[in-house]
């Protein structure tokens, strides 16, 4: 029998420096987790210790907090090279600033392969991308040698910026070819390695031959055997195993998100590749492992960057930017309709000649927005204004949801209005009017949404059965502020970008801002 | 007053199975590395596995003369470590001590030891 | 596996003699990480459980008393008593942590005069 020690990481999304245990900026160091100075530390400890040991990520390092708004990848692989990782998969989010941004700062840059079997370039740049991501490499590990094989959301043009010479193919018919290859180059130990979300790698695990093990990401699973050592609740144990269609126990692991976790699996082979047996956990990188040193030392040169940064205008104002409790708990404020019209700007993907764009509406908890934007400061925008507005590190994600649901939440929006509470929605391609002096739970009298299958825009009245994209902040997805509706009976839920990324980005790309309050929630007369 | 008391140890033929406890008090268990160290009559000491603390998953190591036949596990609410042995052989008879190693990273020896437990493999 | 030899296998001494015993590892227990030695000693009296003295090769664990010594680096050690007592009679043991398996030596064997 041989023993491998699968080391791995998943949507870290730019949590270089240590985090608070929600994986928000970091406050009180002594109860802070993850980074990478710590994650080396551990990872340095287990390849002492272990003597068959593979690090490998399952993509969107990119995206989440100004590292990648300022470095813009260099920073990934410039410390995933410090850490040595073996290998990485391509996820949706490192098509964030297109395939230029893909290509030259991590592709050129990154001293470890870079996979992904279900991509696919053609023209131009088929050749200009040659060889700098595979779908599969052959590593050596000890005496042996191990195949991972790649692979990346078949969604990511809806999610991200990949352009039009990339096409994104189905996984299993894209992987179970490289898995073939793979075994007629007598590699008998293959790890699928990549960032489609739990389900898909179940059935990766299930529908394509020869995978011994499936390593992901995008879905933040985290799953764990025996008592959790912090918040997270686990979706199942680890490894999660999954009998494939020819018989065999495959192990699927996934590490949550942010770098708070190490997940760590053990395989044992027999000779001819099969997998014997499999446990392990993640291994939760609290304040109880050591910074290294010397990584902690370079994430602080690199760091006095980001702080420059902050304070740098992104744009201007020319109208007062009312983020207040006041205003953002009990109408339409301008704030909010700024943040919405930002979510859906970041979200424009023209896949389709039949839709203007594939989403249309946002919404957005009042309780959200933190703080106003002056704009008797000479107009001036800074990063650091728009973390007081959001100082919560959440990102603005895609839902798909039916009309039912959406009608729930703007129920929920009201259902105890007049008390200041964070539930309040503040929208972008929604007209919405309340009768207040109707019951809680019956207040939504008129409810229209912008259409996303029409050469110009308009509002139609919501249909109850039909399903709908939605952008919305993490928080809300999750159930937040009492959205319990939205967890329970979402259709599909991608994370997207950092908040504050998505909304800085815009003001950059409009230069002069003037959001106005414009009627997009309005209260039927004599109720308010 | 830190403390680790086995139990469970006891005459087994060849072949058979045992299941040893390790009672600790004094100490927050959850925290801690357990191992467990075995030391046959009038010889050196062994290293038989760890079971990492909750934080790194409560996963386990094994040395090679054990694997597949001994188990650790534990008990955290309980503050119980446990040592399943299967398949038992005579060369397993030993004076089994429960240890717990320091809490502070990497440090992987052996600060606590019970007073442990005699184990006999004999027809 | 990392393989750890003692020597000598046992020793007589007086009271108050000085006493040094040794230990080599079959590879290098310093690691560059951190430049510390993964090395432990114990003492293990007549009858009783063993007894943590030394770590990281040096470091004397709390209420040691300061007679027992740890030195050395890599693959080379050494554990000295400046004036053994007769309370000192026991074997004592040393173990690498840097990998798995953990490994003991075979112990040294001090006995009194």
């Known amino acids: 029998a041989w023993e491998l020690t699968i080391l791995h990481t998943n949507d870290v999304h730019s949590r270089l420096e240590q985090t608070s245990e929600d994986s928000s900026k970091c406050v009180n160091a002594s109860r802070c987790m993850g980074g990478v100075a710590r994650l080396f530390t551990k990872v340095q400890q287990i390849r002492r210790a272990e003597p068959n040991v593979l690090l490998l990520d399952a993509g969107d390092q990119y995206q989440g907090t100004i590292w990648f708004t300022v470095y813009k990848g260099a920073e990934v692989a410039h410390f995933m090279n410090a850490l040595r990782y073996d290998a990485m998969a391509l996820g949706n989010h490192e098509f964030d600033n297109g395939v230029e941004g893909l290509i030259e700062p991590l592709l050129k840059e990154a001293k470890f392969p870079i996979l992904s079997a279900n991509i696919k370039a053609k023209g131009p740049l088929a050749s200009q991308i040659s060889g700098l991501y595979l779908p599969y490499k052959v590593l050596p590990v000890g005496d042996e040698v191990v195949g991972i094989v790649g692979y990346t959301s078949k969604e990511t043009p809806f999610l991200s910026n990949p352009g039009t010479n990339l096409v994104f193919e189905d996984e299993i018919t894209a992987l179970q070819p490289e898995v073939d290859k793979l075994k007629t180059l007598n590699v008998n130990k293959i790890i699928a390695l990549g960032h489609s979300g739990f389900e898909m790698d179940k059935l990766i695990a299930q529908k394509v031959r020869g995978v011994d093990v499936v390593v992901g990401g995008h879905s933040n699973t985290f799953l764990y055997t025996g008592n959790p050592p912090s918040k997270e609740v686990p979706a199942g144990k680890y490894p999660f195993i999954v009998t494939s269609d020819d018989g065999r126990k495959v192990p699927v692991v996934q590490a949550y998100a942010f770098g708070k976790y190490l997940g760590y699996l053990k395989i044992e082979f027999d000779e001819r590749g099969n997998v014997i047996s499999s446990h392990g956990n993640p291994i939760l990188l609290n304040s109880s492992i050591p910074e290294d040193p010397s990584i902690k030392a370079d994430i602080n040169k690199w760091r006095i960057k980001l702080d420059n940064y902050s304070t740098q205008e992104l744009g201007k104002t020319i109208v007062y930017l009312d983020g207040s409790s006041q205003s953002c708990r009990f109408r339409e404020c301008n704030m909010g309709n700024l943040i919405c019209d930002a979510m859906i700007n970041n979200n424009l993907r023209h896949t389709d000649e039949m839709f203007w764009n594939h989403v249309s509406m946002c919404i957005l908890n009042g309780g959200g927005i933190r703080s106003p934007i002056d704009e008797r400061n000479n107009g001036t925008i800074t990063w650091e204004n728009l973390a007081a507005v959001l100082p919560f590190g959440g990102t603005f994600d895609l839902v798909q949801l039916k009309g039912s649901t959406l009608k729930k939440a703007f129920e929920h929006s009201v259902h105890r209005y007049g008390q200041s509470t964070g539930e309040f929605l503040q929208v972008g391609g929604i007209h919405v009017v309340y009768d207040l002096s109707r019951k809680p739970g019956d207040r939504v009298v008129k409810l229209d949404v912008l259409c996303t299958k029409c050469r110009v825009p308009s509002y139609d009245p919501l249909k109850m059965d039909e399903v709908y994209k939605v952008i919305l902040p993490n928080f809300l997805a999750n159930g937040g502020d009492g959205f319990q509706m939205i967890k329970d009976e979402l259709l599909r839920h991608d994370s997207g970008d950092q908040d504050i990324n998505v909304v800085s980005t815009y003001i950059s790309k409009m230069k002069v801002i003037y959001p106005a309050v414009e009627g997009r929630i309005k209260f039927s007369t004599g109720s308010h | 007053e830190v403390k680790l008391v086995e139990s469970g140890g006891g005459l087994v033929q060849p072949g058979g199975s045992l299941r040893l406890s390790c009672a600790a008090s004094?100490?927050?268990?959850?925290?801690?590395?357990m191992s467990w160290v075995r030391q046959p009559p009038g010889k050196a000491l062994e290293w038989l596995g760890f079971?990492?603390?909750?934080?790194?998953?409560?996963?386990?190591e094994y040395s090679a003369s054990v694997k597949g036949r001994f188990t650790i596990s534990r008990d955290n609410s309980q503050s119980i470590l446990y040592l399943q042995m299967n398949a038992l052989r005579p060369e397993d008879s030993a004076t089994y001590y429960c240890?717990?190693?320091?809490?502070?990273?990497?440090?992987?020896?052996?600060?606590?030891w019970g007073t442990g437990t005699t184990v006999t493999v004999s027809s | 596996d990392i393989v750890m030899s003692q020597s000598p296998s046992s020793l007589a001494v007086s009271v108050g003699e000085k006493v040094t015993m040794t230990c080599k590892s079959s590879?290098?227990?310093?690691?560059?990480?951190?430049?510390?030695?993964?090395l432990a000693w114990y003492q293990q009296k007549p009858g009783q459980s063993p007894k943590l003295l030394i770590y990281?090769?040096?470091t004397r664990e709390s209420g040691v008393p300061d007679r027992f010594t740890g030195s050395g680096s890599g693959t080379d050690f050494t554990l000295t008593l400046s004036s053994v007592k007769a309370e000192d009679l026991a074997v004592y043991y040393c173990?690498?942590?840097?990998?798995?398996?953990?490994?003991f030596g075979s112990g040294t064997k001090l006995e009194i005069k």
């Open positions: 004094g100490f927050t268990f959850t925290d801690y590395y």
């Open positions: 240890t717990r190693s320091p809490i502070y990273f990497d440090n992987w020896y052996f600060d606590v």
């Open positions: 173990q690498q942590y840097y990998s798995y398996p953990f490994t």
């Open positions: 990281w090769a040096s």
């Open positions: 079971i990492r603390n909750k934080a790194d998953g409560s996963t386990t």
């Open positions: 590879q290098s227990l310093l690691y560059s990480n951190n430049q510390k030695n993964y």
